[in-house]
């Protein structure tokens, strides 16, 4: 089948990194600089993506594969193929329309991107707070007070909703 196809269409013999040049008797010509063909049998090479402006090159374009971009330092990618760059914030912050803002009490963000999320409410699982939450870290839930033998607990049982370690009600 391959042989039949190549007899019918000489372009099918052109490998990735080349194109079937109609101006030169359909011979396989290498892709020109700043272009690529990722599959065989192509009649043109595609132009390489430029990683300029807020984008920077993560992977250079080659004759067989397109360039890949990421974002300049202090920014991270959004969208398919890194189609937008968004400013990083510090851990314990989230990006709002007014810039980076600290997480509100009862929420945390342990990354440089994304939004602040509520602390885990340990009491919903019948557990107690082992380690209090911060702006950068979620609470750590421990065994439920009932699981601990009397006198052995160093953990205070869940109390009013405003106590650190609980999501605001």
């Amino acid at each position: 089948f391959e042989r039949t196809r190549s007899l019918q269409d000489p372009c099918s013999n052109c490998p990735a990194g080349t194109f079937c040049d109609n101006n030169r008797n359909q011979i396989c010509s290498p892709c020109p600089p700043n272009s690529f063909s990722s599959a065989g049998g192509q009649r043109t090479c595609d132009i390489c993506r430029q990683c300029k402006g807020v984008f920077r090159t993560r992977k250079e374009c080659s004759s067989t594969s397109n360039a890949e971009c990421d974002c300049t330092p202090g920014f991270h990618c959004l969208g398919a193929g890194c189609s937008m760059c968004e400013q990083d914030c510090k851990q314990g912050q989230e990006l709002t329309k007014k810039g980076c803002k600290d997480c509100c009490f009862g929420t945390f963000n342990d990354q440089k991107r994304g939004i602040c999320r509520p602390w885990t409410n340990c009491s919903l699982d019948g557990k107690s707070v082992l380690v209090n939450g911060t702006k950068e870290r979620d609470v750590v839930c421990g065994p439920s007070p009932a699981d601990l033998s009397p006198g052995a607990s160093s953990v205070t049982p869940p109390a009013p909703a405003r106590e650190p370690g609980h999501s605001p009600q």
Epitope: Q50, G53, V54, T72, G74, A80, G81, M84, Q87, G99
Partner: antibody
Framework: QVQLQQWGAGLLKPSETLSLTCAVY????????WSWIRQPPGKGLEWIGE???????DSNPSLKGRVTFSVDTSKNQFSLKLNSVTAADTAVYYC?????????WGQGTLVTVSS | EIVMTQSPATLSVSPGERATLSCRAS??????LAWYQQKPGQAPRLLIY???TRATGIPARFSGSGSGTEFTLTISSLQSEDFAVYYC?????????FGGGTKVEIK
């Protein structure tokens, strides 16, 4: 909220220099690329060029040689100068933030070139 | 430079109907394409980036699709505030270029 506010002379004579400034309020200034785009009356949009806080620039080859960008990081402002203007440069000029696409825009300034 | 071509130049649609706008690139631009809405006397507003991702605060009735050279912006049910001019823009390669725009008007 990120806001871009722009100003500059609205009426020029041929051969004069167009000068516009854009101030950025809210959000971060450094790290972003800041662009200028223009729109002739009743027509489409044309990218003029861009500058980053460090002063690095890029511009449309169709305007190269006539366009200059500058930045004042102490005021969170960037500026455009276009020299030797003609009637073909009559347009609404916009400043915008470049994050890949243009996600925030200034209100636009109509610049008319007429003798 | 990459030339962006939009069609139709004008689209007449009744409120509540679906609007489909097309944008074609002269060369493949993967999905590195944005759509903007512009109302008279206003600056353009970003609707879609990466060909299909809605920008912050953009209603779900706006959707983008396509890859390579053919792209579509669909407004599923036109509201009165959607009558405007829409532009596509590639940022795959410099210089950055825009399409000529599609005016969506009330039928």
């Amino acid at each position: 909220q990120v806001q871009l506010q722009q100003w500059g002379a609205g009426l020029l004579k041929p051969s004069e220099t167009l000068s516009l400034t854009c101030a950025v309020y809210g959000g971060s200034f450094s790290g972003y690329y800041w662009s200028w785009i223009r729109q002739p009356p009743g027509k489409g949009l044309e990218w003029i060029g861009e500058i980053i806080h460090s002063g690095s620039t890029d511009s449309n080859p169709s305007l190269k040689g006539r366009v200059t960008f500058s930045v004042d990081t102490s005021k969170n402002q960037f500026s455009l100068k276009l020299n030797s203007v003609t009637a073909a440069d009559t347009a609404v000029y916009y400043c915008a933030r470049l994050t890949g696409p243009f996600d925030y825009w200034g209100q636009g300034t109509l610049v008319t070139v007429s003798s | 430079e990459i030339v962006m071509t939009q069609s139709p130049a004008t689209l007449s649609v009744s409120p509540g109907e679906r609007a489909t706008l097309s944008c074609r690139a002269s060369q493949s631009i993967s999905s590195i394409l944005a759509w903007y809405q512009q109302k008279p006397g206003q600056a353009p507003r970003l609707l879609i980036y990466g060909a299909s991702t809605r920008a912050t605060g953009i209603p779900a009735r706006f959707s983008g699709s396509g890859s390579g050279t053919e792209f579509t912006l669909t407004i599923s049910s036109l509201q009165s505030e959607d009558f405007a001019v829409y532009y596509c823009q590639q940022y795959y390669n410099w210089p950055l270029t825009f399409g000529g725009g599609t005016k969506v008007e009330i039928k």
